[in-house]
């Protein structure tokens, strides 16, 4: 059973994936530039379902695009590079969805628009922290 | 790890059918377009055509439209290029490369060398 | 079919140069045109995307400009790891067309 050490670890873990998708959507929404309309056409890959940790392979499998995608701003909008901003997206997810269990993510058949991908990634995180507190 | 390894060396003989497979790892294969493109010794890169794992759906260059088929094998993350009536201007490297919308050709397969001779 | 001419065909270099690169595409292609580097006997590396992103993890003296027909790529400051053949790639339409290829080469 989880002890409240590790469900608070998860819980603060959560919080910072959160934020930094909060911050991606946020620099998304505040960035007027030609290259917006091209980033607006990339569809990514939803999870068919996302109700558990384990499902964060689904995220952790379109962080890469996200990455080349958020690089065509090439804006001083996200305070740090994508590529940084991602590492450490990756890493939180790493550690979330845990490394040792081979999850195959199932996607749903439509695809979804960046910003449309970062609410449900937001959604999904504001759901989970509410079942810990 | 992002990974596509491809079948070893090959040589045939004129008329005869190729065929390359190229395995994809490190991600979802139904996600990403799989295209292949050759190079002639000392030539430059030609684009031979692509095909979705997911649907099978394929498109090809003219100069390779009834010669060239495209298929996969899914459950393994596999697909496959098949080059037939084989001439010796067809010996080349044949590359595989996947492709998503207008993320084109960021991983490649390490190449596999046809050789076609009598 | 979209013709993407390459020049110079060829160029000789100096560690430290300068050194540019033109793809002119046949027609308008947006900026739907990669930029990738080969060195021989190895598969090809994306160096540069949708025109002027660069690929995560290329050194940042690489970069890519232009829109519509007329695209250049640029190292500011060629290395000795930089001699090797560039290519470009539209991928506005099918076909897909590579220009002819660029040989960097040590003056």
């Known amino acids: 059973a989880p002890t409240s050490s590790s469900t608070k670890k998860t819980q603060l873990q959560l919080e910072h994936l959160l934020l930094d998708l909060q911050m991606i959507l946020n620099g998304i929404n505040n960035y007027k530039n030609p290259k917006l309309t091209r980033m607006l056409t990339f569809k990514f890959y939803m999870p068919k379902k996302a109700t558990e940790l384990k499902h964060l392979q689904c995220l952790e499998e379109e962080l890469k695009p996200l990455e080349e995608v958020l690089n065509l701003a090439q804006s001083k909008n996200f305070h740090l590079r994508p590529r940084d901003l991602i590492s450490n997206i990756n890493v939180i997810v790493l550690e979330l969805k845990g490394s040792e269990t081979t999850f195959m993510c199932e996607y749903a058949d439509e695809t979804a628009t960046i910003v449309e991908f970062l609410n449900r990634w937001i959604t999904f995180c504001q759901s989970i922290i509410s079942t810990l507190t | 790890q992002v990974q596509l390894v491809q079948s070893g060396a090959e040589v045939k003989k004129p008329g005869a059918s190729v065929k390359v497979s190229c395995k994809a790892s490190?991600?979802?294969?139904?996600?990403?377009?799989i295209n292949w493109v050759r190079q002639a010794t000392g030539q430059g890169l030609e684009w031979m055509g692509w095909m979705n794992p997911n649907s099978g759906n394929t498109g090809y260059a003219q100069k390779f439209q009834g010669r060239v088929t495209m298929t996969r094998n899914t459950s393994i993350s596999t697909a496959y290029m098949e080059l037939s009536s084989l001439r010796s201007e067809d010996t080349a490297v044949y590359y595989c490369?996947?492709?998503?919308?207008?993320?084109?050709?960021?991983?490649w397969g390490q190449g596999t060398l046809v050789t076609v001779s009598s | 079919d979209i013709q993407m001419t390459q020049s110079p065909s060829s160029l000789s270099a100096s560690v430290g140069d300068r050194v540019t690169i033109t793809c002119r595409a046949s027609?308008?292609?947006?900026?739907?045109l990669g930029w990738y580097q080969q060195k021989p006997g190895k598969a090809p590396k994306r160096l540069i995307y949708?025109?002027?992103s660069l690929q995560s993890g290329v050194p940042s003296r690489f970069s890519g400009s232009g829109s519509g027909t007329e695209f250049t790529l640029t190292i500011s400051s060629l290395q000795p790891e930089d001699f090797a053949t560039y290519y470009c790639?539209?991928?506005?339409?099918?076909?897909?067309?590579f220009g002819q290829g660029t040989k960097v080469e040590i003056k």
């Open positions: 490190g991600y979802t294969f139904t996600n990403y377009d």
């Open positions: 490369a996947r492709s998503r919308q207008w993320l084109v050709l960021d991983y």
């Open positions: 949708i025109a002027t």
């Open positions: 027609q308008g292609i947006r900026d739907d």
């Open positions: 790639l539209q991928h506005i339409s099918y076909p897909w067309t």
